[in-house]
């Protein structure tokens, strides 16, 4: 808290300008009118205030707006945003995408701070859903944003927003998140033709079920091994050697390099060695000839 003292004669600030950088903390408190500060917030960013001086300016705004700042002030906070706590931000009602962009710009190049996370949370909740423009903005600043959301939060993403997602935005997503995003992507891209569809859907395939992988295998898609390795193990296991060969096309020889990694390892264990040998890759670990394969999954389902 800054002690209340009278403003020295002739020091009363008529506008927010560079002369204020020479004011002591107590002078700023006494001589800068909070309402003036609120209307001229856009000037603060251009003035090299110290961190201590910014603390005083924040204190003045807090006193003026104890229930939370209006958006007209928030939009022009600039570096003062870095002084805000998540508790401060929870009082705000941010509805403009321009305001969001302005504040994200201040934090650009840094990890997502608790302040930014709270700001985004307030903004998205205020909008009711993650629309395309918001998603575009958030992933531009934080490529990993989408994967930081829970499956429940992702369920509010409309399929139309999926068009804004770039492959790198999904790099850190886990299978549970892709399970939610894949059906939305499938819906979003359903009217595209075969090769274009595959290019778009590829990043989401970690959530694809077996039947969709079987369908893709009929379309000459030539899936690369990096994508194949991200597929759900339970979706890959039922695929036949012929289907995997069609799915991967010329990339099928890459199975050898990944034969000890999941899902390739588990898939190999489910195939007949005879069938694996037809690939000519030297894959080992399949079911030997003459062995009977019992599918116990049906039995488990019935019991």
């Amino acid at each position: 808290e800054v002690e209340k003292t009278a403003c020295p004669s002739g020091k009363k600030a008529r506008e927010i300008d560079e002369s204020l950088i020479f004011y002591k903390k107590w002078e700023l408190e006494a001589c800068v009118d909070a309402a003036l500060l609120a209307t001229q917030m856009d000037r603060v960013n251009a003035i090299p205030f110290t961190y201590e001086q910014l603390d005083v300016l924040k204190h003045k705004l807090d006193e003026l707006y104890p229930q939370g700042y209006p958006e007209s002030v928030i939009q022009h906070l600039g570096y003062l945003f870095l002084k805000m706590s998540p508790e401060d931000i929870r009082k705000w009602n941010v509805t403009s995408l321009e305001t969001l962009k302005a504040l994200l710009e201040v934090n650009k190049g840094h990890e997502m701070s608790p302040q930014v996370a709270t700001l985004i949370d307030r903004f998205v909740k205020g909008r009711g859903q993650l629309d395309k423009d918001t998603l575009d903005t958030l992933t531009a600043f934080y490529p990993g944003y989408l994967c930081s959301l829970s499956p429940e939060e992702l369920s509010s993403v409309p399929p139309s927003s999926i068009w804004a997602v770039r492959p790198q935005d999904l790099d850190t997503c886990d299978p549970r998140q892709l399970d939610v995003l894949y059906p939305k992507a499938r819906l979003a891209f359903q009217n595209m033709n075969g090769s274009e569809y595959f290019v778009k859907i590829q990043s989401f395939l970690g959530g694809a079920p077996t039947e969709d992988l079987k369908a893709l295998s009929q379309q000459n898609v030539s899936m690369d091994l990096a994508t194949f390795m991200k597929l759900r193990t339970d979706a890959v296991l039922p695929l036949t050697v012929a289907e995997v060969q069609k799915l991967l096309g010329p990339h099928v020889e890459g199975l050898k390099a990944e034969e000890r990694h999941r899902p390739v390892r588990d898939w190999i264990l489910r195939q007949r060695q005879d069938d694996l040998d037809t690939l000519g890759l030297g894959l080992q670990g399949g079911i030997p000839n003459g062995y009977l394969v019992l599918d116990l999954s049906m039995q488990e389902a019935l019991s």
Partner: antibody, heavy 119, light 108 residues
Framework: EVQLVQSGAEVKKPGASVKVSCKAS????????MDWVRQAPGQGLEWMGD????????IYNQKFQGRVTMTEDKSTSTVYMELSSLRSEDTAVYYC????????????WGQGTTVTVSS | EIVLTQSPATLSLSPGERATLSCSAS???????LSWYQQKPGSSPRLLIY???NLASGIPARFSGSGSGTDYTLTISSLEPEDFAVYYC?????????FGGGTKVEIK
């Protein structure tokens, strides 16, 4: 420019552990496995294992099983190799090497990290 | 595991001469799964050839590779001063991946 930058040299006592980092840049981190290869002084190359940064799946050379742990941090595009229960014969230069998923050759190597184990 | 034996251990040649390096596997290696690396003192290895005969990016055409089964060869048609180094063959046909002991190509 594709780069693999490794952490600095380490001197450890027998029985201790060492953790070497390898930070990747200039390419899509999850499209390549990261392998670790070591080279004892005046000796040849020895493959230790690999990690798939996309899934976190690891494969270790049986020789190091139980002593080596490879991990990744996708948020920083960094992989780590920790070797425990160090002995003098673990004194070597440890390299991380990038391997495109689906291939078995290493097209980019880190600069190497010298680990010296001495009492 | 597959043991790769490289010969000779050291090859003493002059610039401009042809170098032939051998790599012999203890059991058959699928040719797609064999590669060669070059290493200079104090430096990291560098990929030269993959899949037995494919030149890696930026590697001059004087380097070539051949072979199948258990016998593989790296040839440098005409040695340049920068080619004097240690060369390693490497297989990933069988687990665990292994490297040969290396052939040192030195200036005569």
């Amino acid at each position: 420019e594709v780069q693999l930058v490794q952490s600095g040299a380490e001197v450890k006592k027998p029985g201790a552990s060492v953790k070497v980092s390898c930070k990747a840049s200039g390419y899509t981190f999850t499209d390549y496995n990261m392998d670790w290869v070591r080279q004892a002084p005046g000796q040849g190359l020895e493959w230790m294992g690999d990690i798939n940064p996309s899934t976190g799946g690891t494969i270790y050379n049986q020789k190091f099983q139980g002593r080596v742990t490879m991990t990744e941090d996708k948020s920083t595009s960094t992989v780590y190799m920790e070797l425990s229960s160090l002995r003098s014969e673990d004194t070597a230069v440890y390299y991380c090497a990038r391997r495109r998923i689906g291939t078995g050759y290493f097209d980019v190597w880190g600069q190497g990290t010298t680990v010296t184990v001495s009492s | 595991e597959i043991v790769l034996t490289q010969s000779p251990a050291t090859l003493s040649l002059s610039p401009g001469e042809r170098a032939t390096l051998s790599c012999s596997a203890s059991s058959s290696v699928i040719s797609s799964y064999l590669s060669w690396y070059q290493q200079k003192p104090g430096s990291s290895p560098r990929l030269l050839i993959y899949r037995t005969s494919n030149l890696a990016s930026g590697i001059p055409a004087r380097f070539s590779g051949s072979g199948s089964g258990t016998d593989y060869t790296l040839t440098i048609s005409s040695l340049e001063p920068e080619d004097f180094a240690v060369y390693y063959c490497h297989q990933w046909s069988s687990f665990p991946y292994t490297f040969g002991g290396g052939t040192k190509v030195e200036i005569k």
